[in-house]
């Protein structure tokens, strides 16, 4: 996160850290807890690393430096990448992770509510992006979970800024015209959440941007509302019943 500040314990209890353990262990992506056994993240996090066994999912944590060999983590039972995601393009950057064992909810580890299907009418004015990603383009992973308040940008405006790419209706953009605040490398897959009528909702999944926090280069996020049918289909077919935090 560029231009952010430290988060507090329990402030973003749905935020998870997706880490890979090969020879060393490192944080690669963020994710959002959406049910006892489900995490929503970006498909591109698994490019070149599709093996379930190498991943460790840490929930209910604030500081990555607090993680030791004794820190509990979740393992992956199944990675479900959107069927239309292609490595050669930036569309449908969404994936579900089914955990091997369900998580208990606590003050520091609980799910984020999902938006209504095709939610286009709600005007979100209080949106935040969180993650342990770089604090500048040529930076490094941060220890303490960062947060930043960023306004949404219309798709029309976003398309003007990204003429080389197709900004689809299944994407949502956020950023300041002057730059300075944005997601960055390592924040991929994490949440863009907006508070509406007193409730936090998962509006976007951190996907991509041209550099980080550059002027007139908003961040681009997968629009969760556009994938509600897919999310429900995959979680229900796997569970027999939905275990999601549906919107109030």
């Amino acid at each position: 996160i560029v231009g952010g500040t430290n988060s507090s314990w329990g402030e973003w209890p749905w935020q998870v850290s997706l880490q890979v353990k090969l020879t060393a262990q490192r944080h690669l992506c963020g994710g959002s807890l959406i049910g006892h056994q489900w995490v929503l993240t970006a498909a591109h996090c698994f490019d070149g690393l599709p093996l379930q066994d190498v991943w460790r999912i840490y929930s209910g944590i604030l500081n990555l430096s607090d993680i030791t060999k004794d820190t509990p983590f979740s393992q992956i039972k199944e990675i479900i990448i959107h069927q239309n995601y292609k490595v050669s393009e930036g569309n449908h950057d969404i994936a579900l992770i089914k955990l091997q064992a369900p998580l208990n909810y606590t003050e520091f580890q609980k799910p984020i509510c999902l938006p209504s299907k095709g939610d286009t009418s709600t005007i979100y004015t209080n949106c935040w992006v969180t993650g342990w990603g770089f604090s500048k383009e040529k930076g490094e992973i941060q220890n303490i979970l960062q947060k930043v308040n960023i306004p949404l940008v219309t798709n029309e405006e976003c398309q003007k800024r990204y003429q080389d790419y197709k900004i689809t209706q299944r994407m949502v953009c956020a950023g300041y015209k002057e730059g300075g605040k944005d997601a960055c490398k390592g924040d991929s897959g994490g949440p863009l959440v907006c508070k509406h009528n007193g409730m936090w909702r998962l509006v976007g999944i951190t996907s991509w941007g041209e550099g980080c926090a550059r002027r007139e280069q908003p961040g681009v996020y997968t629009k969760v509302a556009e994938y509600m049918d897919w999310i429900l289909e995959k979680t229900q077919s796997s569970d027999g019943k939905a275990q999601m935090q549906s919107p109030a």
């Epitope: 490019d47 050669s88 080389d164 790419y165």
Partner: antibody, heavy 125, light 108 residues
């Protein structure tokens, strides 16, 4: 299966014009940047031009700027290269290529993942 | 413009040998925008490596790419008969997009 098929090459006199076409199939053409690359006989590859998915943004190599025009018709899944004021040094095999723009670590990538078979343009009197 | 300088110009090696091809750039190139292509006579180029180190679909694991900034390398761990040809590095970090002049890998 992704396919790119160039056509329109041939022999043309210096100062003449030619229009190359590239018919695309097997993918959502309107989502991709497209590019032209050329290769003079016995020489290396030279990038010529690219066009954005909508067609609203185009960039050219200095060697062809003001003479060549790249365009596309997304309804026909076709890429074009209009070549005017041709010179002997424009003699080359012209390839159209798809520009993949995937996502790696929250940034986009760019690389030419699919190529046509090429069409030969010969500029000679 | 970003100049791409490949070395050596020609590499004469026997099957089974290791090939190391270098690509140096005149300015910093974001690794995401560095690719390697193979071309055999009479054929269109074929993508081998993108993002400096990711193998394209269907490319055998004897091909690997490394590098950062201005110094990139393509390695073929054990040359196979079908690997002979010309290899090009290319950047699309800044326009104009540019190719190296190529390294020809020939049978010794």
């Amino acid at each position: 299966e992704v396919q790119l098929l160039e056509s329109g090459g041939g022999l043309v006199q210096p100062g003449g014009s030619l229009r190359l076409s590239c018919a695309a199939s097997g993918f959502t053409f309107s989502h991709y940047l497209m590019t032209w690359v050329r290769q003079a006989p016995g020489k290396g590859l030279e990038w010529v031009s690219y066009i954005s998915p909508s067609g609203g943004h185009t960039i050219y190599a200095d060697s062809v700027k003001g003479r060549f025009t790249i365009s596309r018709d997304n309804s026909k899944n076709t890429l074009y290269l209009q070549m005017n004021s041709l010179r002997a040094e424009d003699t080359a095999v012209y390839y159209c290529a798809r520009v993949a723009t995937g996502i790696v670590a929250r940034s986009r990538t760019r690389y030419f993942d699919q190529w046509g078979q090429g069409t030969l343009v010969t500029v000679s009197s | 413009d970003i100049q791409m300088t490949q070395s050596p110009g020609t590499l004469s090696l026997s099957p089974g040998e290791r090939a190391t091809l270098s690509c140096r750039t005149s300015q910093f190139v974001n690794s995401n925008y560095l690719a390697w292509y193979q071309q055999t006579p009479g054929q269109a180029p074929r993508l081998l490596i993108y993002g400096a180190s990711s193998r394209a679909t269907g490319i055998p694991d004897r091909f690997s790419g490394t590098g950062y900034g201005t110094d990139f390398t393509l390695t073929i761990s054990r040359l196979e008969p079908e690997d002979y040809g010309t290899y090009y590095c290319q950047q699309s970090s800044r326009t104009p997009w540019t190719f190296g002049q190529g390294t020809r890998v020939e049978i010794k």
